[in-house]
Interface confidence: low
Amino acid sequence: QLTIESRPFNVAEGKEVLLLAHNVSQNLFGYIWYKGERVDASRRIGSCVIRTQQITPGPAHSGRETIDFNASLLIQNVTQSDTGSYTIQVIKEDLVNEEATGQFRVYPELPKPYITSNNSNPIEDKDAVALTCEPETQDTTYLWWVNNQSLPVSPRLELSSDNRTLTVFNIPRNDTTSYKCETQNPVSVRRSDPVTLNVLYGPDAPTISPLNTPYRAGEYLNLTCHAASNPTAQYFWFVNGTFQQSTQELFIPNITVNNSGSYMCQAHNSATGLNRTTVTAITVYAELPKPYITSNNSNPIEDKDAVTLTCEPETQDTTYLWWVNNQRLSVSSRLELSNDNRTLTVFNIPRNDTTFYECETQNPVSVRRSDPVTLNVLYGPDAPTISPLNTPYRAGENLNLSCHAASNPAAQYFWFVNGTFQQSTQELFIPNITVNNSGSYMCQAHNSATGLNRTTVTAITVYVELPKPYISSNNSNPIEDKDAVTLTCEPVAENTTYLWWVNNQSLSVSPRLQLSNGNRILTLLSVTRNDTGPYECGIQNSESAKRSDPVTLNVTYGPDTPIISPPDLSYRSGANLNLSCHSDSNPSPQYSWLINGTLRQHTQVLFISKITSNNNGAYACFVSNLATGRNNSIVKNISVSSGDSAPGSSGLSASGSGSGLNDIFEAQKIEWHHHHHH
């Protein structure tokens, strides 16, 4: 069966197409090509008679058709109007006709497509954008590429029914998606340039930088405002609500505290018409001055006044700290801070408080510390002390009294003697005092700041110094058991106590010792030899005491009964006789020896050599005391034998008068007396 093949079936405009007849019978007379689906002489393109090799163009021949003897039709430089059916009529030699119809389509060569948008500047997350692939051409297939990938399934992407329009929803900012469209027809494939969407957004809340507040006065302020925005935001600065300038940067040189405030940056998007603002508080701090401490009471009174120390000057946004003795203030019942720490109250301040206080001010740009302050605590006067307290005073000395009272400020001193004001000095000096200067000495201490007075009284006694006493006696040589002795302590003094010592012991009164005349006179009744003393008298008054030199009594006594030694009574003939006589006596007695009634010698010792029986007899020792007028004697009978001595009898003693011995004694006394004076 006769068929027609189109090579190619789809022909690009301007190209050529070859229509080939297949299964063409043998013995052909010729054939004729027609435009269209049927034989129509008016639409004949051309004919070919094989035998004559004659090709004849027909009325539908455009000059671009070429008929070949192999029953093919070549059409060159085709146009879209060439699209359609072409019919071949084959005429066999038996003049029987055979027909076949073929067709091809002519498509334009597609131009490079481009993308148009219904909204060149969509607003983020708000506007949908319709992207249309241009131009619109017949018989064209439209495809879309997103980021060089075929169109993904997404709720944000929607295609029109002809695929020519792509609608994009909810477009985020900074969407860098690349969109391309592709056009296809049977003869060409073309792809557009990529398109990205210019998404309008913002402004976001602007950020102000740097946020290096606080600032120090004298620095510069350079603030930059930035807000994410498309198109780029316009910026407006307001300070404390007042418009300043429309720049992204705000620069203020040499700022002062007055530049502190509320700095607002307003970002404006001219495309979206939106404004966003951010406020930052800029604080400019002045460099703090050196602080100083003021006090509500420069001179507090000890343990009474509270002192309020205030850190000056008061400055805004300043932190106040206190230092006590170079240590950070610690909790104490004596220290109290105000709420703002600017005031420190000190309670119960003791005297001599040397604590020093400093205050420190801090702000974010500076730290300063004051000079130290110490409190001048007023106190006193305490009870004054008067010195020296070496009363009593001796007449003729100098009186130099000093008064001192602990006090701040230093006390003023006033002296009163027996209630009469004397002088206003700390020292009271009286030279060469007398008894009349005795009295009540009062020192008054006065504190001019506290207004307080304190007094101390001391009694000053001035005495005349007692003389050294001495003892007078009515009898320096009293006789024992006979005389009474009167010892008198001299001199007489008023207001004086008299004291006696005997043998360095205080006098013990006995019936034989009597005191009289205010103890000034000591009477010894019937003295004994043991009353020799020594005797001392003392005088004393409240200021002094004096003691006499010792006095001893020369008590005369005796003589006592003498003793002859040795006691032997019998002697051998030819022996030496050596007798010694002793009698206790004051003064020492006069000794006399009588042998058988005859005065032999005035010695205490009797010596006879080579005694014989002739020396037998009564040996008498006589003692005589011229002072007492008393005498005493003892007789001893001595026997001399040619052999052993026989036992002898004890001697006989005699004393006093009324015997022969005594007469001899009296005669002897006269002789002694006579001898004593020659």
């Epitope: 509320s262 000057p313 805004q316």
Partner: antibody, heavy 120, light 107 residues
Framework: EVQLVESGGGLVQPGGSLRLSCAAS????????MSWVRQAPGKGLEWVSY????????YYADSVKGRFTISRDNSKNTLYLQMNSLRAEDTAVYYC?????????????WGQGTLVTVSS | DIQMTQSPSSLSASVGDRVTITCRAS??????LAWYQQKPGKAPKLLIY???TLQSGVPSRFSGSGSGTDFTLTISSLQPEDFATYYC?????????FGQGTKLEIK
């Protein structure tokens, strides 16, 4: 535009109480120290009380110490003065005033005032 | 407390005059001094602070000077709207105290 509007004034008997309010607008209230200043009829100005921007520091004139309390609510942009134990000598126009920004010193903005009359 | 003493207490002047008001502090307040203007029935208005700093919007005919204890407010050329009562105030710590005021009247 900065605005300070006082309210709460009126007639009160001696010993009574009042609470004054001051509503602020047109500026960042929380950044400004505030004070109350009063003016007795025909007399001069007398500072009454001060509060720092964040409310942590308050001061009072001796004449009102212990009777008046200053406070603020930055979330409501409002300043208050609680006045107790009122006396005849407290009669005055009470102004709220915003200090110059960043300063506890000069009074940059003033309200129109509210009259407090203490009388029996 | 720091006392502020203003002088004079009242002053008569004409438009165009140069006027000076003085304020004395009882102790050193460094430069912590402000000046206010008050018209009848109105709230005070800050003119000058820190002795010499002009508040925003205040005409330049107002100026301040001084330091320590003695301060001066000067109006270089009086305008009709300047007739009011003027107060000085120290802002050197609490209690903030005002001067007793100077009433500026038209002569």
């Amino acid at each position: 535009e900065v605005q300070l509007v006082e309210s709460g004034g009126g007639l009160v008997q001696p010993g009574g109480s009042l609470r004054l309010s001051c509503a602020a607008s047109g500026f960042v209230f929380s950044s400004y120290d505030m004070s109350w200043v009063r003016q007795a009829p025909g007399k001069g100005l007398e500072w009454v009380s001060y509060i720092s921007s964040y409310g942590g520091i308050t001061y009072y004139a001796d004449s009102v110490k212990g009777r008046f309390t200053i406070s603020r609510d930055n979330s409501k942009n409002t300043l208050y003065l609680q006045m107790n134990s009122l006396r005849a000598e407290d009669t005055a126009v009470y102004y709220c005033a915003a200090h110059y920004f960043g300063s506890s010193g000069p009074f940059a903005y003033w309200g129109q005032g509210t009259l407090v009359t203490v009388s029996s | 407390d720091i006392q502020m003493t203003q002088s004079p207490s009242s002053l008569s002047a004409s438009v165009g005059d140069r006027v000076t008001i003085t304020c004395r502090a009882s102790e050193n307040i460094f430069a912590y001094l402000a000046w206010y203007q008050q018209k009848p029935g109105k709230a005070p208005k800050l003119l000058i602070y820190n002795t010499r700093t002009l508040q925003s919007g205040v005409p330049s005919r107002f100026s301040g000077s001084g330091s320590g204890t003695d301060f001066t407010l000067t109006i270089s050329s009086l305008q009709p709207e300047d007739f009011a009562t003027y107060y000085c105030q120290h802002h050197y710590g609490t209690p903030f105290t005002f001067g007793q005021g100077t009433k500026l009247e038209i002569k």
